[in-house]
């Protein structure tokens, strides 16, 4: 029983997370225009992954894609690439997964094909997830760089005379989404992976009897050499196990940075 | 046809107070930004306050910062400017505008007359 | 708060005559995020409130004849009528659309010559 609640809740938070990573890509508010310190503007203008936006005082707002790929800057392009890798594989995960779960019935699906299936979706959800908030870190990373030089060049000018007044971006709402999303998503790959341990089938185990014999006894161990590997836990099974464990700390990110604004 | 209609101007003693309205049709009131501009006699047009679409922004000239408020009523497509602690400079044709594209103001109403005098 | 300067006070010009009229602000209006220039123009005859001409420094507002064209971007901004008719004696006032507090500049009356 608890196993299935693991197994359940680990998709329901992997679909939310899921959800959100969708989202926070689609989302415009990715940077948004520093409002602190500044001098209060009529324009408010924001910027996504895919369009830049301006909300005009007057309650119109234009929004422009970026039309252009090869244009565009790299890290840019790899916040995308990273984005749409979470959703591709989130979305994968979320369809086997599916399958995997243990209180829906397929046919004559083993509880051992179940367990195979609840672990490849937990590692893709986990993957999706450290895809999420990478991509979010990059550009995160990206907005701080930004900030802190256009802080430092704020007011350009000649003769003392202010001429143009630099536009700050910081974080916008999307990154929050993002973040969050994307713990979700490992946290319900996480859940998924532990369900697995629970729903992999163990061998029927057999404990010796003693037959007595007039003059010597003997143990019989039934199953000839199968009692072997009869004790414990499945070998096959735990291996499966620790291998899908060892890949949770497979992907790295390392943000760079990149002036995008 | 898009219609705005000042009043609740008048003569006014120092220090006193009064309440402009602007009557708004022909247009999506609840969705536009709408602001006040004022003119002195003779002189040249001042930006006194403007209020957002959603209520949530207000912004006032420094000269009535304190003084004036603007508020609008959406169920009733009114603007209004609430003038309080009046003084002489403030003495001026008082007109209700829309914003539109680049927060240019698109539409005008003819203006109401202010007259703050002992 | 942003300064609109207006240049010249007056100007008298003649009828199918070419107007130019200045402003100047003292920061820059030019958006980043759609590189609009947020200034507007206005044109006010006696007893009348003013009609918008020109926002987002050369965008005609529907109905404007297209003698009035606006150009410049950052603090310069022009204003020209390139033939004057009648109806177009009037005073011409620059609006910053961009920053709070948004300030007029002091206006330009055109005059008949």
């Known amino acids: 029983m608890a196993v299935t609640a693991c197994q359940g809740l680990g998709f329901v938070v992997s679909l939310i997370g899921i959800a959100g990573i969708i989202a926070a890509t689609c989302m415009d508010q990715w940077s948004t225009q520093d409002l602190y310190n500044n001098p209060v503007t009529a324009v408010f203008n924001y910027q996504g992954l895919w369009r830049s936006c301006v909300r005009e005082s007057s309650g119109f707002t234009e929004c422009r894609g970026y039309f252009t790929l090869l244009g565009l800057p790299a890290m840019l392009q790899a916040v995308r690439a990273l984005m749409i890798v979470g959703i591709v594989l989130g979305a994968i995960g979320l369809l086997v997964s599916i399958f995997a779960l243990k209180c829906i019935r397929i046919g004559s699906m083993e509880d051992s094909a179940k367990a195979n299936m609840t672990l490849t979706s937990g590692i893709m959800f986990i993957v999706s997830g450290l895809c999420a908030i990478a991509g979010v870190s990059v550009f995160a990373n990206m907005l701080v760089t930004n900030f802190w030089m256009s802080t430092a060049n704020m007011y350009t000018g000649m003769g003392g005379m202010v001429q143009t007044v630099q536009t700050r971006y910081t974080f916008g709402a999307a990154l929050f989404v993002g973040w969050v999303a994307g713990g979700l998503t490992l946290i319900g790959g996480v859940m998924m992976c532990i369900a697995c341990r629970g729903l992999a089938p163990e061998e029927t185990n057999y404990k010796a009897v003693s037959y007595h014999a007039s003059g010597h006894s003997v143990a019989y161990k039934p199953g000839g050499f199968k009692a072997s590997t009869g004790f414990g836990s499945n070998t096959k099974n735990k291996k499966i196990y620790d291998g899908g464990a060892r890949t949770e700390d497979e992907v790295q990110s390392y943000p760079s940075k990149h002036d995008y604004v | 046809e898009v219609q705005l209609v000042e009043s609740g101007g008048g003569l006014v003693k120092p220090g006193g107070s009064l309440r402009l309205s602007c009557a708004a049709s022909g247009f999506s009131f609840s969705n536009s930004a709408m602001s006040w501009v004022r003119q002195a006699p003779g002189k040249g047009l001042e930006w006194v306050s403007t209020?957002?679409?959603?209520?949530?922004?207000?912004y006032y000239a420094d000269s009535v910062k304190g003084r004036f408020t603007i508020s609008r009523d959406n169920a009733k497509n009114s603007l209004y400017l609430q003038m309080n602690s009046l003084r002489a400079e403030d003495t001026a044709v008082y007109y209700c505008a829309r914003q539109g594209y680049g927060n240019a103001l698109d539409y005008w109403g003819q203006g109401t007359l202010v007259t703050v005098s002992s | 708060d942003i300064v609109m300067t207006q240049s010249p006070d007056s100007l008298a010009v003649s009828l199918g005559e070419r107007a130019t009229i200045n402003c100047k602000s003292s920061q820059s209006l030019l958006n980043s995020g759609n590189q609009k220039n947020y200034l507007t123009w206005y044109q006010q005859k006696p007893g009348q409130p003013p009609k918008l001409l020109i926002y987002w420094s050369s965008t005609r507002e529907s109905g404007v004849p297209d003698r009035f064209s606006g150009s410049g971007s950052g603090t310069d901004f022009t204003l020209t009528i390139s033939s004057l008719q009648a109806e177009d004696f009037a005073v011409y006032y620059c609006?910053?659309?961009?920053?709070?507090?948004?300030?007029f500049g002091g206006g330009t009356k055109v005059e008949i010559k």
């Open positions: 609006q910053n659309d961009y920053y709070y507090p948004l300030t």
């Open positions: 209020i957002s679409s959603g209520d949530s922004y207000t």
